[in-house]
């Protein structure tokens, strides 16, 4: 594969580990066919931004986890009243235990019914999934090359839909096997549409496959 690395990739590295191609390399090929564009952001700045994005993502995840904990607490507080034992004696506590046992039995029955429904749904989902696999079985899935994840992709993975609102998330290009015909690719789905649509793509496939 031709070396189309950016400034960040050219900077000296402490260990001569095999270079994993960045998605930005491929993006450069796709968007600027005839001229390599110098990165406007230095490697240290990129790292700083990536760290910042990770921190934001971490905070967001922590906040979501806290929200879930709070929601669980609220749900439990509505279902489980405080025991309020002050002033109650042995007789009332006996009766309270009976009441709570009756409540537990009722909840257990409900849980059993829900579990039965869930099991039924899981079975149905498994059956449908199997049917999908059976239908897709005749098509060979292309093997995808691993690329170093970009800050954009990392944010999308961590924040999901929210990242799209604030960041320019670009599609990752994927490696294609020589033997995959156009017909098969069309049948498999839209995964290559964006790449094939780009100008001069056919002429540079060899670079991806080297």
């Amino acid at each position: 594969m031709a070396d189309g690395s950016s400034d960040a990739a050219r900077e000296p590295r402490p260990a001569p580990a095999p270079i994993r191609r960045r998605s930005s390399n491929y993006r450069a090929y796709a968007t600027e066919p005839h001229a390599k564009k110098k990165s406007k952001i230095s490697a240290s700045r990129k790292l700083q931004l990536k760290t910042l994005l990770l921190q934001i993502a971490k905070q967001e995840l922590e906040r979501e986890a806290e929200e879930r904990r709070g929601e669980k607490g609220r749900a439990l507080s509505t279902r489980c009243q405080p025991l309020e034992l002050a002033g109650l004696g042995f007789a009332e506590l006996q009766d309270l235990c009976r009441q709570l046992h009756a409540r537990v039995d009722k909840v257990d029955e409900e849980r059993y019914d829900i579990e039965a429904k869930v099991t039924k749904n899981i079975t149905e989902i498994a059956d449908l999934t199997q049917k999908i696999f059976d239908l897709r079985g005749k098509f060979k899935r292309p093997t995808l090359r691993r690329v170093r994840i970009s800050a954009d992709a990392m944010m999308q993975a961590l924040l999901g839909a929210r990242a799209k609102e604030s960041l320019d998330l670009r599609a990752h290009l994927k490696q294609v096997k020589k033997e995959d015909t156009e017909k098969e690719n069309r049948e498999v789905g839209d995964w290559r549409k964006n790449i094939d649509a780009l100008s001069g793509m056919e002429g540079r496939k060899k670079k991806f496959e080297s």
Epitope: Q81, P82, E84, A86, G87, G89, F90, L93, D95, L96
Partner: antibody
């Protein structure tokens, strides 16, 4: 000084309904379970209802279950007894009492003066 | 329901006497027994809880004892202000139940 004052009693016909109130003072009301106890014309004492300190749990004897409802308003330091489908055997002096406990033993440590309820056709 | 019974519905005694009022439960109530005093004007007061514990502000002339199904309240050196009706109440099992009461009178 711990004090309980009942009100709302009266004379009514069988099948009627009535709501008794008990205003408590002299202690932290929300920390205590409360009870209603009645005394029949024959001078027998009968436990009628108990409610936990926060109002989540209530207890009744079979004789009033489904007809009587004990409730409380901790903000107003007031205990209530809603009585429906009253019968002649519900005729009694109704006392409001504070509950306390000691190693599982519960008791009514302070009582009000009582409110008279008469059910007669 | 646990039935509570007193041996006598009324008792006559003289001032200064030692008076014992008995109470029996239809089954073991594991010391969950309380004693109350009702004055002629209708006011009710707790005297003894958990068989033998004296409630605050109650004269030490009052004492309680017993276990299992048999319990008693003792008034040593009877005074005029002790003339009242005495009730025992079990707190072992719901419904909470009282006895019919023992009316204490002067001879």
């Amino acid at each position: 000084e711990v004090q309980m004052v009942e009100s709302g009693g009266g004379l009514l016909k069988p099948g009627g309904s009535l709501k008794l109130s008990c205003a408590a003072s002299g202690f932290t009301y929300s920390n205590y379970a409360m009870s209603w106890v009645r005394q029949t014309p024959e001078k027998r004492l009968e436990w009628v209802a108990t409610i936990s300190s926060g109002g989540s749990y209530s207890y009744y004897p079979d004789s009033v279950k489904g007809r009587f409802t004990i409730s409380r308003d901790n903000a107003k330091n007031t205990l209530y007894l809603q009585m429906l489908s009253l019968r002649s055997e519900d005729t009694a002096m109704y006392y409001c009492a504070r509950r306390d406990n000691y190693f599982g033993s519960s008791f009514m440590d302070y009582w009000g003066q009582g409110s008279s309820v008469t059910v007669s056709s | 329901d646990i039935q509570m019974t007193q041996t006598s519905s009324s008792l006559s005694a003289s001032l200064g006497d030692r008076v014992t009022i008995s109470c029996r439960a239809s089954q073991d109530i594991t010391n969950y027994l309380n004693w109350y005093q009702q004055k002629p004007d209708g006011t009710i007061k707790l005297l003894i809880y958990y068989t033998s514990r004296l409630h605050s502000g109650v004269s030490s002339r009052f004492s309680g004892s017993g276990s299992g199904t048999d319990y008693s309240l003792t008034i040593s050196n009877l005074e005029q202000e002790d003339i009242a009706t005495y009730f025992c109440q079990q707190g072992n099992t719901l419904p909470l139940t009282f006895d019919t009461g023992t009316k204490l009178e002067l001879k």
